[in-house]
């Protein structure tokens, strides 16, 4: 990536890291308003299976692993990217390495959920306070989950699907910060590990993933009022280990693995028409990216 100053632009979709033949250090940003991609400062260490989030205008890369010809190292790292300076800086590491992690943000705090360290599948969850640069464990999930999708709705943290070390999961659970406890919610219609999970219009969406046999293109959404999962239009491509985010009322899914190919495809879902469309391609195919959108 280039090390010059990043252009001062509006809301961008950032994609960090990923995997193609080895873990990647790319940081790139897509501008949906003009369809352009920016090549930004590389991660200091390549990583795949990471998660991305934005707090206070800063992009955070959380966990993952560096799978390279020299070896394979799960990551406990938290790194912070400042779009104004186009620079990465390390923050306090998590208590344990977490590959194929999920993250969510509540009240400016980052929650790191599940993931794996070697063959250990975590149910543990920890919270990062940026102002103190500190991590603290909170209540563990009821289920061990890697490849878990995480989303925040109404200040509640949802952990959806994943792999517990034995089975891929259709179960989901919800964390109540005030009570510091997890409760199971209605299971999805479909087993999904490595799905993309996000929130749009008061619903939690779970897109794609892997059911233990095949990659999926199906998409379902959870209505917190009715506590039910309902299928919506499927994506054009089957994909697991995809990136996902929401930008201006639409869902964007980035890359992933379809069982044969590392996808460069980026699809966009319009909830008004219940349709998916191909909007762009990443500069190269990859799975296991961390994705987030800058705030206004």
């Amino acid at each position: 990536g280039s090390m010059g100053h990043a252009p001062k632009v509006g809301r961008l979709i950032y994609t960090a890291g990923g995997y193609f033949r080895q873990s990647l250090s790319y940081l790139e940003a897509y501008n949906p308003s003009d369809g352009t991609w920016l090549d930004l400062a590389d991660l200091q260490v390549p990583r795949s299976g990471l998660a991305g989030c934005v707090v206070g205008g800063l992009l955070y890369a959380v966990g993952g692993r560096n799978n390279s010809p020299d070896g394979n190292t799960d990551s406990s790292a938290l790194d912070c990217y400042n779009p104004m300076t186009n620079q990465w800086s390390p923050c306090a590491p998590m208590s344990v390495p977490r590959n194929r992690i999920g993250v969510g943000v509540i009240d400016g705090h980052i929650y790191a959920v599940g993931g794996s360290h070697g063959c250990i599948h975590h149910n543990s969850v920890e919270r990062y306070e940026p102002e103190r640069d500190e991590w603290h464990l909170v209540a563990p999930m009821l289920t061990r989950r890697i490849g878990v999708g995480v989303a925040v709705l109404n200040r509640l943290l949802y952990a959806v699907g994943g792999f517990d070390g034995t089975n891929r999961l259709n179960s989901a659970e919800c964390y109540y910060p005030e009570r510091n406890e997890w409760r199971m919610i209605t299971a999805m219609n479909t087993i999904r590990s490595g799905a993309g999970v996000c929130v749009l219009h008061n619903c939690i969406y779970a897109a794609g993933g892997y059911d233990g046999q095949d990659q999926l293109n199906s998409v379902e959404r959870y209505d917190v009022e009715t506590e039910t999962w309902t299928f919506v239009a499927p994506m054009k491509h089957r994909r697991s280990a995809l990136g996902i985010t929401v930008h201006q009322g639409r869902i964007y899914v980035l890359g992933g693995y379809d069982g044969h190919t590392f996808l460069d495809s980026v699809e966009c879902y319009d909830p008004d028409t219940d349709t998916w469309s191909e909007v762009t391609r990443m500069t190269s195919g990859r799975s296991g990216v961390g994705v987030a959108v800058t705030m206004e």
């Epitope: 063959c119 250990i120 233990g212 046999q213 095949d214 697991s240 693995y257 069982g259 590392f262 799975s287």
Partner: antibody, heavy 118, light 107 residues
Amino acid sequence: EVQLVESGGGLVQPGGSLRLSCAASGFAISASSIHWVRQAPGKGLEWVASIDPETGETLYAKSVAGRFTISADTSKNTAYLQMNSLRAEDTAVYYCARERAEYASDAWGQGTLVTVSS
Amino acid sequence: DIQMTQSPSSLSASVGDRVTITCRASQSVSSAVAWYQQKPGKAPKLLIYSASSLYSGVPSRFSGSRSGTDFTLTISSLQPEDFATYYCQQSYSFPSTFGQGTKVEIK
């Protein structure tokens, strides 16, 4: 019945290449991590490479990294090991194996012998 | 890399004997250890996974146990078909590694 059948072994000169195949039946390779494990004559077992069906990520032993490539074709239900820049120390019987969820391999092929010699 | 030190490298025993094979991991591997049996010219066969779980179809005379970083495969009453080489394997961390093997021979 779950079955794995390797093929593609043979005699090759140092620096040469071979592609091993592992044809699966009785299960879908898209449902399991596939590993290659080798055994030099009269020696023990050595893990070589694996491929994850969910993420597509591959792992390699340091002794083969950069020279060997593992892949899978789910339409043919077959896994492959492309071996380049072969060395005398790569001489071994090569087995493919299916990993069960608990990180152990519960189904193995019969093996295919690779001999690297001039 | 994690070393799996297997002992003994060979042993002689009689039908009906109780046989114990040990693997010691050079660092913690949790319970991510499997045991395999291999006969000459054949592929390995899974006996035990997760340190102590008996794989389906394996006779109950085989058992596995763990004490810290020490792992034991026990054959409670050796049968003629059990004369073979046995390997342990750790899959706790990359790369997966095997013990050097224990050859069980007829006394």
